[in-house]
Interface confidence: low
Amino acid sequence: GELETSDVVTVVLGQDAKLPCFYRGDSGEQVGQVAWARVDAGEGAQELALLHSKYGLHVSPAYEGRVEQPPPPRNPLDGSVLLRNAVQADEGEYECRVSTFPAGSFQARLRLRVLVPPLPSLNPGPALEEGQGLTLAASCTAEGSPAPSVTWDTEVKGTTSSRSFKHSRSAAVTSEFHLVPSRSMNGQPLTCVVSHPGLLQDQRITHILHVSFLAEASVRGLEDQNLWHIGREGAMLKCLSEGQPPPSYNWTRLDGPLPSGVRVDGDTLGFPPLTTEHSGIYVCHVSNEFSSRDSQVTVDVLDPQEDSGKQVDLVSAS
């Protein structure tokens, strides 16, 4: 007769490992007992269990509660055992030694491989700002056994770099995604994809990109200079900008306080019926955490009865 087993048994951490050992003998042959031991190189054999045809299963104290026979029905020639709740430390070489009658003893070895699926983590890089050079957008780390694969899935143009750290029973892989920040990347997903034989499907962690920027500010409302005359109703200045984080707007008048009756509503400055007191240099100050921008306009309210030119000065600054 001969022993049937597997060269390698692979199990995911926490699952039960079936260690197969089946004696395929001639008719009339019997199995008296099956002894299981762990036999890692350089270390003495450590007994797991003894499976006796008459007295049943005896488990060594070190494996008490962790070694069982497979559920019935059982074949008397089957010396397989179940190792419950496999841990990384269980990984190694195992030997089954089968005592048969009348053929004598047989032995076979197998290797137990315990897969440790990774628990990936994604860490965003420093705050992204338009105008930076190549910048770390995010790093993704996954540790497992064997080493996991870490890749990126995104529409964003960038570069990746990976490094691996080997530990005694596992390996940690870190992949970094670098990019040159631009405002068009705002809201774009950057997904870390981790593959591993211990995972039923790839694990994905998505990070939404936020790029700080502040567009130049400009003021609309002075396109038709002739409308800025005494008595005009509904005159307004609107400050235009965009940014991430969304900017806040502040209106001031450079050459004095805002005249009474002028309404500030966020990005808009609304005027009551115009008088000459509304003349002056108005400043829209746009700011977010990234930067600040100014746009200035000079308003000169004229008497429509007079045929004089009007100076309008537009200045944007950053």
Partner: antibody, heavy 116, light 107 residues
Framework: EVQLVESGGGLVQPGRSLKVSCAAS????????MAWVRQAPTKGLEWVAS????????YYRDSVKGRFTVSRDNEKSTLYLQMDSLRSEDTATYYC?????????WGQGVMVTVSS | NIVLTQSPATLSVTPGESVSLSCRAS??????IHWYQQKSNESPRLLIK???QSISGIPSRFSGSGSGTDFTLSINRVESEDFSIYYC?????????FGAGTKLELK
């Protein structure tokens, strides 16, 4: 009324460190970029460092990069300049200034003397 | 880095004269130049921003002009309190530079 008041100057030996502060009042500090400008005795103005409103971005002149660190505490409306590995050529009056992108308000300045 | 060159280094005038101080940038900076006055033992004071924009509280005799690379600070009828050092300044790529200054002194 906008006020910028520097403090923390003094005499320090070469290679040592010093931290100067600038307490701001009279405006919403967190809306403004801030800067440090220095002036060596009998010399002109020299920009040293600046920081954006949220404190995310900092910028330095080449000669102080790696030695000076500008920071801010928006809750305390205070600007800081940590100066390490000081050299004799860092001797100057250090001004705190509000910028956007000109320096519209300046503090009275604080004297830093680096000498053995 | 953009270099600002101020001329002349020293300007000697008598009160009542009108003067022009020059600031030249090594490359075009649109209207991104700002002017400061620094009196002896005082902090600098902003006079003009964005080449020509006046600042509240600054006497009207101070005016600025220019764009691109050539800028001028004009003082109409210099008064005794105007004898100071005048600096131009610009910002480029988040870095700031000053000119070396023009000293306005009593002739």
């Amino acid at each position: 009324e906008v006020q910028l008041v520097e403090s923390g100057g003094g005499l320090v030996q070469p290679g040592r460190s010093l931290k100067v502060s600038c307490a701001a009042s009279g405006f919403t500090f967190s809306n403004y970029d801030m800067a440090w400008v220095r002036q060596a005795p009998t010399k002109g103005l020299e920009w040293v460092a600046s920081i954006n409103p949220g404190g995310i971005s900092t910028y330095y002149r080449d000669s102080v990069k790696g030695r000076f660190t500008v920071s801010r505490d928006n809750e305390k409306s205070t600007l800081y300049l940590q100066m390490d590995s000081l050299r004799s050529e860092d001797t100057a009056t250090y001004y705190c200034a509000r910028r956007q992108p000109y320096f519209d308000y300046w503090g009275q300045g604080v004297m830093v003397t680096v000498s053995s | 880095n953009i270099v600002l060159t101020q001329s002349p280094a020293t300007l000697s005038v008598t009160p009542g004269e009108s003067v022009s101080l020059s600031c030249r940038a090594s490359q075009s900076i649109s209207t991104g130049i700002h002017w400061y006055q620094q009196k002896s033992n005082e902090s600098p004071r902003l006079l003009i921003k964005f080449a020509s924009q006046s600042i509240s509280g600054i006497p009207s005799r101070f005016s600025g002009s220019g764009s691109g690379t050539d800028f001028t600070l004009s003082i109409n009828r210099v008064e005794s309190e105007d004898f100071s050092i005048y600096y131009c300044q610009q910002r480029d790529s988040s870095l700031f530079t000053f000119g070396a200054g023009t000293k306005l002194e009593l002739k």
